[in-house]
Interface confidence: low
């Protein structure tokens, strides 16, 4: 559901990742969008504590920019997804091993909740930066 509004990020988890002046998309399908999205990030962030030093910063950037997407504040506020190329770089370059483990756990049903699924984008479904430079966010 892409109904929501733009607001400055005022959470804590993604403070170091998101630009200070960034407007993020808050999804009104949640009763309290700020709190719900922050909880999503927080839950997924804890999983990242065990990943490699190479993967972690890339994964954190992907995670924060996926859950707190950049917001285009027109008449109808619109979330701007991450560019496919950046998502693939994290998946196949920085975090290849960790991504495989996560996908395997998902298929085997080892996650207790579906919360992590919301925090991991499907790279193939994201727009390419080469189609329309304004259609996606560059990390």
């Amino acid at each position: 559901d892409n109904k929501g509004y733009c607001a400055q990020y005022r959470g804590e988890v993604c403070n170091a990742v998101l630009a200070k002046d960034a407007l993020v998309f808050l999804n009104t399908s949640y009763a309290d969008p700020e709190e719900a999205q922050e909880l999503l990030v927080h839950t997924a962030w804890n999983e990242l504590k065990v990943v490699s030093p190479v993967c972690r910063p890339a994964a954190e950037a992907l995670l924060c920019n996926h859950i707190f997407q950049e917001c285009s504040p027109g008449v109808v506020p619109t979330p701007i997804p991450i560019c496919r190329e950046y998502c693939l770089a994290v998946k196949e370059l920085f975090c290849a091993k960790e991504w495989l483990v996560m996908e395997e756990k998902t298929h085997r049903g080892l996650y207790r909740s579906e919360m992590h699924l919301l925090s991991v984008p499907e790279c193939s479904k994201l727009p390419s930066m080469h189609w329309d430079p304004t259609a996606c966010a560059r990390l």
Partner: antibody, heavy 118, light 112 residues
Framework: QVQLQESGPGLVKPSETLSLTCTVS????????WTWIRQPAGKGLEWIGR???????DYNPSLKSRVTMSVDTSKNQFSLKLSSVTAADTAVYYC????????????WGQGTMVTVSS | DIVMTQSPLSLPVTPGEPASISCRSS???????????LDWYLQKPGQSPQLLIY???NRASGVPDRFSGSGSGTDFTLKISRVEAEDVGIYYC?????????FGQGTKLEIK
């Protein structure tokens, strides 16, 4: 050091449009909200609205139907237009920078007096 | 809109003495991130307003340490530990939590 300078006509006729420009010098206009605030003589401060460098705007609901703001990043300027003015719009108009880090207006222009009179 | 109410509206003070200004908001300015979105400004005679305190209690760059901000939620206070002649002017509180940002009516500090 960033400085702001308002410019525009000091006298506007009733029912006409007030137009002001704020020039940002000593730094970039990018990545900030830029704001207009006014102060009628001997009275308090009223927030008119703000514009982000992307061009997105937020206006005070009390003035929304009459206000238009724009930004020209190439010139490091942003502008205010207030239509259908009356004597009640006579005030000192300030431009100011809204600093995300402080959540406050950390830099102000010196203000420009605009009188609405025939 | 959030309504900001200041008191007193006029404050005569003897140099060297302390001064205190109160500001109340019609709804809480405490965000769940722990910050109070309340700023204080001073407008000296013939000048533009200048930032004194941001986010309730943080002194802006260059502001003397005799100025301090306190409070949380809906009740806030600006204190000047020892008033100096250069402190004269009108003090405004402003809420930065919601659009439109709104100011208090102002408190005029004058030297006795």
């Amino acid at each position: 050091q960033v400085q702001l300078q308002e410019s525009g006509p000091g006298l506007v006729k009733p029912s006409e449009t007030l137009s002001l420009t704020c020039t940002v010098s000593g730094g970039s206009i990018s990545s900030y909200y830029w704001t207009w605030i006014r102060q009628p003589a001997g009275k308090g401060l009223e927030w008119i609205g703000r514009i982000y460098t992307s061009g997105s705007t937020d206006y005070n609901p009390s003035l929304k139907s009459r206000v238009t703001m724009s930004v020209d990043t190439s010139k490091n300027q942003f502008s205010l237009k207030l239509s259908s003015v009356t004597a009640a719009d006579t005030a000192v108009y300030y431009c100011a920078r809204y600093n995300w880090n402080d959540d406050a207006f950390d830099i102000w222009g010196q203000g420009t007096m605009v009188t609405v009179s025939s | 809109d959030i309504v900001m109410t200041q008191s007193p509206l006029s404050l005569p003070v003897t140099p060297g003495e302390p001064a205190s200004i109160s500001c109340r908001s019609s709804q809480s300015l405490l965000h769940r991130n722990g910050y109070n979105y309340l700023d204080w400004y001073l407008q000296k005679p013939g000048q533009s307003p200048q930032l004194l305190i941001y986010l309730g209690s943080n002194r802006a760059s260059g502001v003397p340490d005799r100025f301090s901000g306190s409070g949380s939620g809906t009740d806030f206070t600006l204190k000047i530990s020892r008033v100096e002649a250069e402190d004269v002017g009108i003090y405004y509180c402003m809420q930065a939590l919601q659009i439109p940002h709104t100011f208090g009516q102002g408190t005029k500090l004058e030297i006795k």
